[in-house]
């Protein structure tokens, strides 16, 4: 069953390479278990860069060596990717799986467009 | 680093199906991100399948998704590239390749240092 997803359009990263951006989903009922994944489009290429399982009112936990952090409020999943350079610009997308209890419903959203730009080096001083 | 040798080429018709393997020795395999590339004759090596080192990740290049999967069995030492509904511009040498780095946004930008001899997949009738 399909199931809206928003996330922002655009996002900044910092000059440290750290981007964050809220992923909100219209949960139909009372779901328990939740999967959030994010999605790189760019470069004719599709990336699962990070994953995440979560109980409702508990931590994210992440997949793998994630660059990928997060916390849950509600139907609101706060997520944030470190690491990142300016070859990293892309779209992101926001997909979430309702696991548990059935009926299994999935919303992908959009996608934020996130921009990275690395920090000019210091010029030498004297 | 990790030793690979690839299995599994063969000539397939259009539409068919094959499955390649990917068989490491040395190195602590599940240190490795693993990725398939491929070149066809007269062109550049081109980013295929990538999969993360527990194997909980992948990323695929847009003209094999849906169509190709990438799997590890890290126990085995063995990564594993299926292809289905092959067309003849799939046809090229398959190679696999080790990476000994985490998983970030651009896996087919990773450091690559371990490579295969690669396989040949031909697509024809």
């Known amino acids: 069953k399909a199931m809206h997803v928003a996330q922002p359009a655009v996002v900044l990263a910092s000059s440290r390479g750290i981007a964050s951006f809220v992923c909100e989903y219209a949960s139909p009922g009372k779901a328990t278990e939740v999967r959030v994944t994010v999605l790189r489009q760019a470069d004719s290429q599709v990336t699962e860069v990070c994953a995440a399982t979560y109980m409702m009112g508990n931590e994210l936990t992440f997949l793998d060596d994630s660059i990928c952090t997060g916390t849950s409020s509600g139907n609101q999943v706060n997520l944030t990717i470190q690491g990142l350079r300016a070859m990293d610009t892309g779209l992101y997308i926001c997909k979430v799986e309702l696991m548990y209890p059935p009926p299994y419903y999935l919303g992908i959203g959009n996608g934020t467009q996130i921009y990275v730009i690395d920090p000019e080096p210091c010029p030498d001083s004297d | 680093e990790v030793q690979l040798v690839e299995s599994g080429g063969d000539l397939v018709q259009p539409g068919g199906s094959l499955r390649l393997s990917c068989a490491a020795s040395?190195?602590?395999?599940?240190?490795?991100?693993v990725g398939w590339f491929r070149q066809a004759p007269g062109k550049d090596r081109e980013f295929v399948t990538a999969i993360s080192r527990s194997g909980s990740l992948k990323a695929y290049a847009d003209s094999v998704k849906d169509r190709f999967t990438i799997s590890r069995d890290n126990a085995k030492k063995m990564a594993y590239l299926q292809m289905n509904s092959l067309k003849p511009e799939d046809t090229a040498v398959y190679y696999c390749?080790?990476?000994?780095?985490?998983?970030?946004?651009?896996?087919?930008?990773?450091?690559?240092?371990?490579w295969g001899q690669g396989t040949q997949v031909t697509v024809s009738s």
């Open positions: 390749a080790g990476a000994p780095v985490p998983w970030g946004a651009r896996p087919s930008l990773f450091t690559y240092d371990s």
């Open positions: 040395g190195r602590t395999f599940s240190n490795y991100t």
